[in-house]
Interface confidence: low
Amino acid sequence: RAPRCRELPAQKWWHTGALYRIGDLQAFQGHGAGNLAGLKGRLDYLSSLKVKGLVLGPIHKNQKDDVAQTDLLQIDPNFGSKEDFDSLLQSAKKKSIRVILDLTPNYRGENSWFSTQVDTVATKVKDALEFWLQAGVDGFQVRDIENLKDASSFLAEWQNITKGFSEDRLLIAGTNSSDLQQILSLLESNKDLLLTSSYLSDSGSTGEHTKSLVTQYLNATGNRWCSWSLSQARLLTSFLPAQLLRLYQLMLFTLPGTPVFSYGDEIGLDAAALPGQPMEAPVMLWDESSFPDIPGAVSANMTVKGQSEDPGSLLSLFRRLSDQRSKERSLLHGDFHAFSAGPGLFSYIRHWDQNERFLVVLNFGDVGLSAGLQASDLPASASLPAKADLLLSTQPGREEGSPLELERLKLEPHEGLLLRFPYAA
C-alpha cells in the first residue's frame, strides 16, 4: 500500500515566491520619469521575474523631519495621484502581483520615525493602515524599526489591524539590526510578522559561517515563516563581491521562507560602478542609455536588455530560480536539513513528502573544492542518493540535466549547484 500523503500546509501568497522592492520610483524608472503611471508600464517586466509581490515606496507626502507636514494618506504629487495608484493596483492584480506599501513615515528625514512625538506618529500609521487596506493594498512595510520606541507593541497593534482586515494581508518590518537576540525579541510578540534585517549581511566570508547563521536563525525561529535578504532595503552588491551574487541568489531562493530582493538585484546592479549614483538607490539599468552621465560607463551586459538576451546571465539565473521556487513543492514549503560537506561549503536538502527533492551545495571559497557530503548528518526521511540530476549551476559549462555522482562532487570557486533527485520509499 502506498504511504499516505502528507497534508499540505496552508500557503499564503507571500509563501509562494519572491518579493521585489522598489524603494525609489525615480531611480527604478530613470530618465526623469519615476511616477506611478510609469511603473504600471514595468509590470510586465516584474511578471517576467515571477515575483509575487511588489514592495513599493514610500510614496506618501513627507517634508523632511516635519511631523505636521507628513501625511501617510496622501501620495506625494511627484509620484502621481491616488487615481494613478488605484490604476496600478488594478493592473498589478490582473498580473497576480500583490502590492505592499511602505509607510515608513519620515523617509526623507534623518530619523525615519522622527525623534519625538512617537504616539502621534503611531496614530498616523494606524489611520494609514486602515485607509490603504480599504484602498486595496495587499500589505505594508515599515523600516528602521530600531528607531521606533516600543516597536514590538506598535507592530503587534499594526499586525492586528492588518490581519483583522484579512488573513491574506502582510506586514513587513525592516531593521538594520544584525543581532539575532534583537531580531527574536521583535518576532516574539508578532506571530505572522515578516522581518527583513541585516542578519545575513556579514555572511559572505565562509560557507561554515553562513551555515551557522542560517541554521541558528531557523532553529531559533522554529516553525515560523521567515524571510531571507541581506538587508531591509539595500542592494546585494552593497554587501557582496560580484563573484558571490549568483551563489546568494541560489541560496536566497532555496532557503525555507520568502526571498526578498531590491530592484536591480536580478542584474547585479552596483552603485559603485555608476559614478555619482547614490549607494541606496542607483538608477536601474534598463539599457545602455539608462546612465548617460558618463558615456561608455555602462556596457550591455550590465543591463536588463543585454542580460535578457544572454541565457548565462545573472538575470536569466534569477528568472530560472524564481520559476523553480514558485512551482516545486519541496522549495515552496519543504523541510530543510543542513549537513556537512567540507570546509568552505554550505549544503542542504529541501524535501516534501513524496515530491521531488532538492540538494543545494554552495562553495563560498575562492578555490575549487571536492564536496564530502556527510549523509550521516541527515535524518532517515532525508537520505541522500548516490546520484542526483544537475538542475542548474551558477557557473557556465556544466551539462545541466545530467546525473552527478554525489561522492565525487567537485565545485568550482564560488560555484553553487542545485541538484534534484526523486523520493525513494
Partner: antibody, heavy 126, light 107 residues
Amino acid sequence: EVQLLQSGAELVKPGASVKLSCTASGFNILDTYIHWVMQRPEQGLEWIGRIDPANGHVKYDPKFQGKATITADTSSNTAYLQLSSLTSEDTAVYYCASPFTTVVATNIYYYGLGYWGHGTSVTVSS
Amino acid sequence: DIVMTQSHKFMSTSLGDRVSITCKASQGVFTAVAWYQQKPGQSPKLLIYSASYRYTGVPDRFTGSGSGTDFTFTISSVQAEDLAVYYCQQHYSTPWTFGGGTKLEIK
C-alpha cells in the same frame, strides 16, 4: 538639563564586589538606555553593556558576562553596575552614559552616547 | 564582535593645520559610527554620530565621513583646545566597540 550623577570613588579588596550607581536628572531613564563603559588607567574605552530600564533587558559584551551585572531602579531613576570577584585588572574608571535622544532613545544602532557621567574610579588593592 | 581599528595611536599636528584620523571596521557597519573626544581627567564627549552628523553644539571644524568599513574624522583647522584623544565607536551592533584611540599632539 540632562545629567548623569555617579557615585563616589571606591577602594576595594581583591575578591570583593562593588556596586556603582548612576542617577539621571533632567530625563526619565524609562525613555532611554543606560550604557556602562570602562576605562583602565592610560587605556582606551571598553563597552561593558547596556540596560533598557523600561523592561530590564540587558546586553553585555561577552567578555564582561559573569563579571558585570547591570540593573535599574526606575522609581529612583537610577542604574547600577555591580562588579564581582574583583582583581587588579578591574581597576578602572567606570562611566555610565546614555544615547543623546531621550524621547525615542531605542536607536541602538544609530546614535552615539551623548550624555556621560563624570565616572567612578574603582581601585582594587589589598 | 566588530573590531574597530584606529591605525595611529598618536598624531602630531600644528595649530591651524587640517588633520584626519581614520578608523576601519572589521565588517560593514553602514554609517553607524560615532567619534568622541576625551581630554585628560574628563569624560568622553560625543562629537559625531552616524558617521557624519555633528552632535549639538559641536563646532563645524569637526566633520566625519565614510560608510561600510572605512571612516574618517577631520578637524579642518586644529585649535589648542582640540588636543585630546579621539575614539571611533560602532553603534551598529551589540556589543558596541571602540577603536583604540588616537592622541592628537602638537609638533
